[in-house]
Amino acid sequence: VSPTFQVVNSIAPVQECSTQLDIVIVLDGSNSIYPWDSVTAFLNDLLERMDIGPKQTQVGIVQYGENVTHEFNLNKYSSTEEVLVAAKKIVQRGGRQTMTALGIDTARKEAFTEARGARRGVKKVMVIVTDGESHDNHRLKKVIQDCEDENIQRFSIAILGSYNRGNLSTEKFVEEIKSIASEPTEKHFFNVSDELALVTIVKTLGERIFALEAT
């Protein structure tokens, strides 16, 4: 798990600077993610404390496996409540492959376009949640560089559940997902033992995303 997240008293005034963020969550919905309820619980806990609205934070969700689906665009919902209802309804689309590079690239090229609600001059944040090595990892380096060129801040989350269930080494997988995260990696990369443990990173992830508003 990521190293210590330091919270000091001086962080409080960050909350007085409520600027805007465009956040796209890129969810691995391939067959190996189980139980899906843990993913929707994670989304609920993360999103319920966000200030979602057309002049505040906007959230879009992209799901990928073999293919990519835009679950909803950044400008689809104009309140936290609406987003929470929509996020609860997201179903696992499945797929035998984990096309992480495709998912990230689609989010960059499509989800972060003005046509889908992205706002000019607003900080872009991508949260990538996946449970396995990508089948298109040869494309990852280029895709991540493209995100970097467009100033997209990336938080990546590695779910180790399928590896732990199969008693497999996680080393290569963790390295891949670390490579997706923005620098400094220790502030942008998370790993959890299984899907159920996703909720145990929500608070730290939320604070880190929220801190971006002030930078």
């Epitope: 190293p3 909350q15 600077c17 939320g206």
Partner: antibody, heavy 120, light 113 residues
Framework: QVQLVQSGAEVKKPGASVRVSCKAS????????MHWVRQAPGQGLEWMGW????????NYAQKFQGRVTMTRDTSISTASMELSRLRSDDTAVYYC?????????????WGQGTLVTVSS | DIVMTQSPDSLAVSLGERATINCKSS????????????LAWYQLKPGQPPKLLIY???TRESGVPDRFSGSGSGTDFTLTISSLQAEDVAVYYC?????????FGGGTKVEIK
């Protein structure tokens, strides 16, 4: 300096509703979640829920679901808590309290408390 | 819900002596992603609102005297008043913020012997 000033004591009959307000000053009201906590006579502290003053989003403790409504008026930096269908065991001191971080809910500033007495 | 259990219910300590209050949670409140314990301590005096003393289990709130200290990890926590003063007579509560609903211990009343 940060201050949370609550409305005055209330006496209500069972079945009625009560509304307690909490006026914030000395900080940016919309930047910090406001929580409500109560303490019944001779009892401990009990969390009721929070409101995000910026978005109006709420999270209520299961025990109070359907009976509590938390609202805010950003123009006057005031959060309010309404509890309906009052019972005698709702007699308590009700506090508003501010959380300094968004996702980690310790409570750094508290209102002075509002005594609500429910009696027939 | 996480249940917080405090002990003892009350405590009588001589002025200048050490007072120790225990708090136990029904599950770990150690937040693994930041390696911090989501536990706070409050002081409650009659007719006054609660006052925050400690958060992250051991971080003293600004302005709180250094005779107050917090320790512990996981499920077992302690608030220590190293040298009890007359103004420390109060009821002390622990609170977890690992998950909602936020829950408090039952309180420990500290008196002077």
């Amino acid at each position: 300096q940060v201050q949370l000033v609550q409305s005055g004591a209330e006496v209500k009959k069972p079945g009625a509703s009560v509304r307690v307000s909490c006026k914030a000053s000395g900080y940016t009201f919309t930047g910090y979640f406001m929580h409500w906590v109560r303490q019944a006579p001779g009892q401990g502290l009990e969390w009721m829920g929070w409101i995000n003053p910026n978005s109006g989003g709420t999270n209520y403790a299961q025990k109070f679901q359907g009976r509590v409504t938390m609202t805010r008026d950003t123009s006057i930096s005031t959060a309010s808590m309404e509890l309906s269908r009052l019972r005698s065991d709702d007699t308590a001191v009700y506090y508003c309290a501010r959380a300094p971080l968004r996702y980690f809910d310790w409570l750094d500033y508290w209102g002075q408390g509002t005594l609500v007495t429910v009696s027939s | 819900d996480i249940v917080m259990t405090q002990s003892p219910d009350s405590l009588a300590v001589s002025l200048g002596e050490r007072a120790t209050i225990n708090c136990k949670s029904s599950q770990s409140v150690l937040y693994s992603s930041n390696n911090k314990n989501c536990l706070a301590w409050y002081q409650l005096k009659p007719g006054q609102p609660p006052k925050l003393l400690i958060y992250w289990a051991s971080t003293r709130e600004s302005g709180v005297p250094d005779r107050f200290s917090g320790s512990g990890s996981g499920t077992d926590f302690t608030l220590t008043i190293s040298s009890l003063q007359a103004e420390d007579v109060a009821v002390y509560y622990c609170q977890q913020y690992y998950s909602t609903p936020l829950t408090f211990g039952g309180g420990t009343k500290v008196e002077i012997k």
